[in-house]
Amino acid sequence: VLPAKPENISCIFYYEENFTCTWSPEKEASYTWYKVKRTYSYGYKSDICSTDNSTRGNHASCSFLPPTITNPDNYTIQVEAQNADGIMKSDITYWNLDAIMKIEPPEIFSVKSVLGIKRMLQIKWIRPVLAPHSSTLKYTLRFRTINSAYWMEVNFTKEDIDRDETYNLTELQAFTEYVMTLRCAPAESMFWSGWSQEKVGTTEEEAPYGLDLWRVLKPAMVDGRRPVQLMWKKATGAPVLEKALGYNIWYFPENNTNLTETVNTTNQTHELYLGGKTYWVYVVSYNSLGESPVATLRIPALNEKTFQCIEAMQACLTQDQLVVEWQSSAPEVDTWMVEWFPDVDSEPSSFSWESVSQARNWTIQKDELKPLWCYNISVYPVLRDRVGQPYSTQAYVQEGIPSAGPVTQADSIGVKTVTITWKEIPKSKRNGFIKNYTIFYQAEDGKEFSKTVNSNILQYRLESLTRRTSYSLQVMASTNAGGTNGTKINFKTLSISHHHHHHHHHH
């Protein structure tokens, strides 16, 4: 059988190294050897691939080496497959070396900010030594912030043959570390060089970017003062490296700036004690280069009616995210504040908050929340300076079986009935939403019975029991992940009801 016709010929010119072609099929059933015929010097010359027989056999690749590699040039390539039965030739393929040239990567030797030019890095590199002198090179510069996995790219060309080349990358974030890598190719080529070694540079520092500001309103104290927990953080989009030296807070009752009070702190939270009126609060951060823009918050009067516009809310899990979505009756509201914290019996240790704009959903990566913990999630509508009524829900990112089952007791034991009561499992041991409870009970040496009830039921009356019989019983609490049995209890039904016994005695 003749060998298969060589097809899918693909060639690449590694500048000043070799011209290599590959083809299919890569393996033949019987021993096959290949000859690659080339014309070069624009068709003036012809030759064959100079691989020796031992490596050429059954090996679908061949390389032409200097000095017969000329550039610029057009080559033709034809592959002949030969076995004991004969020869099969490929079609003749045409290759413009400029279009398939692959060169070495450039070498970045510095990534630096330029004094006085904000949000810019100047990248300097050395053009690869193995690159045609006269050719225009195209470049792709890849860059990312040091803690990000996502690369951004910018493309440009350089015509000059100066070996020391530069590019100014603008519109970056201030005071941020960037990782850079560069690749290049002759302008007409379809093949890019590899990526250069990565190099890191930091943009110049600026005055702080800004703050996101929020509050937790606590119940008024006996003396009428209201504790307001202020909290702030670097605004979304602020440089990662940005450091504030401190924060200035000032606040006053609405329409009464004479009563302005000021506070300076290095913390990112501060408790104020305000009167019952409406207050305005302002916070700025500062560093050695200046102050951030002012963050403003209106604290409503104690008796102010807040608007309500969130009608419903759902929390759902994707493979790696928790997504909370809500529906609103107020289309003009396009800013929302999301709060989330663990639902624990004690005061929550971690309280988180985040602003959402122009969306009615909020997403958090599952790994930012603890599995088996219940989270309270509240969404506040924000319309200009007014904060509306929150809508709250609860969610687990991962449910497990409860750490303990319900503590159970048997009450009102009768001849054929018993009332079973159990306690709710403490929040810290639920590990998920309790879906239902199942009561398992069994007479001594008898068959086991079970009864499942909703999670809002904490008591159940069992009937149709056998008189004067010992029973064992336990209650299982179940989440979506499964159930956990509570303590096993034993009881014995009466031989005669108290009521019947008493009546007989009366006679």
């Epitope: 015929k37 014309t39 068709g43 010359k45 033709t76 002949e80 003749i92």
Partner: antibody, heavy 118, light 112 residues
């Protein structure tokens, strides 16, 4: 239509010089290697010289090396052959030919007769 | 440096098939492409085969080329011979030693 038109032939005495020209039409001249091929009366074809696309590389048969010079003007699309120290054995019809993309001379001129005789 | 050897003449009757061989004296015939040219008396050559076995689009499919490594030869085959096929035929290849083309001595084809 591809056309190659030679000029400049004739009778010349041994030891003297002569210049042949070939005007190219109908193709992008500077994309192709070009050649001169000669044919002595009643004899076979004999390659004389070739030149690369940009003119930087030239190739000659041994018997004409140092005597003949091939050149090209890519702006005017003209191929030239300067023949010095001519000998009687250089007597032949000289053809201008284009080297095609696959190792063949795909277009030829009509030829010009050069006679070297005293 | 190699030479290409062709028979001085070949003849064939009208509508028959003839083959003109072209033997390479040293090196493998398959190492460099072979081309064939037809030349009528007083006319310039015409390329009829290139790259061993490829035919220019304007050339009749009665012309075909091949190479045979066992005899280290290239061959031009003409089927269904016509009177107009009567001409000189030259084979040609590239010789890297002289960095240029080499022509065979030529074969005169006579159609009987």
């Amino acid at each position: 239509e591809v056309q190659l038109v030679e000029s400049g032939g004739g009778l010349v005495q041994p030891g003297r010089s002569m210049k042949l020209s070939c005007a190219a039409f109908g193709f992008t001249f500077n994309n192709y290697y070009m050649a001169w091929v000669r044919q002595a009366p009643t004899k076979g074809l004999e390659w004389v010289a070739s030149i690369s696309t940009g003119g930087g590389n030239t190739f000659y048969r041994d018997s004409v090396k140092g005597r003949f010079t091939i050149s090209r003007d890519n702006v005017k699309s003209i191929l030239s052959l300067q023949m010095d120290s001519l000998r009687s054995e250089d007597t032949a019809t000289y053809y201008c030919a284009r080297h095609g993309t696959i190792a063949a001379m795909d277009y030829w001129g009509q030829g010009v007769m050069v006679t070297v005789s005293s | 440096q190699f030479t290409l050897t062709q028979p001085k003449s070949v003849s064939g009757s009208l509508r028959s098939t003839i083959t003109i061989p072209c033997e390479r004296t040293s090196g493998d015939i398959g190492d460099n492409y072979v081309s064939w040219y037809q030349q009528h008396l007083g006319r310039p050559p015409i390329n009829v085969i290139y790259a061993d076995d490829q035919r220019p689009s304007e050339v009749s499919d009665r012309f075909s080329g091949s190479i045979d490594s066992s005899s280290n030869s290239a061959s031009l085959t003409i089927t269904n011979l016509q009177m107009d096929d009567e001409a000189d035929y030259f084979c040609q290849s590239y010789d890297s030693n002289i960095d240029g083309p080499v022509f065979g001595g030529g074969t005169k084809l006579t159609v009987l």
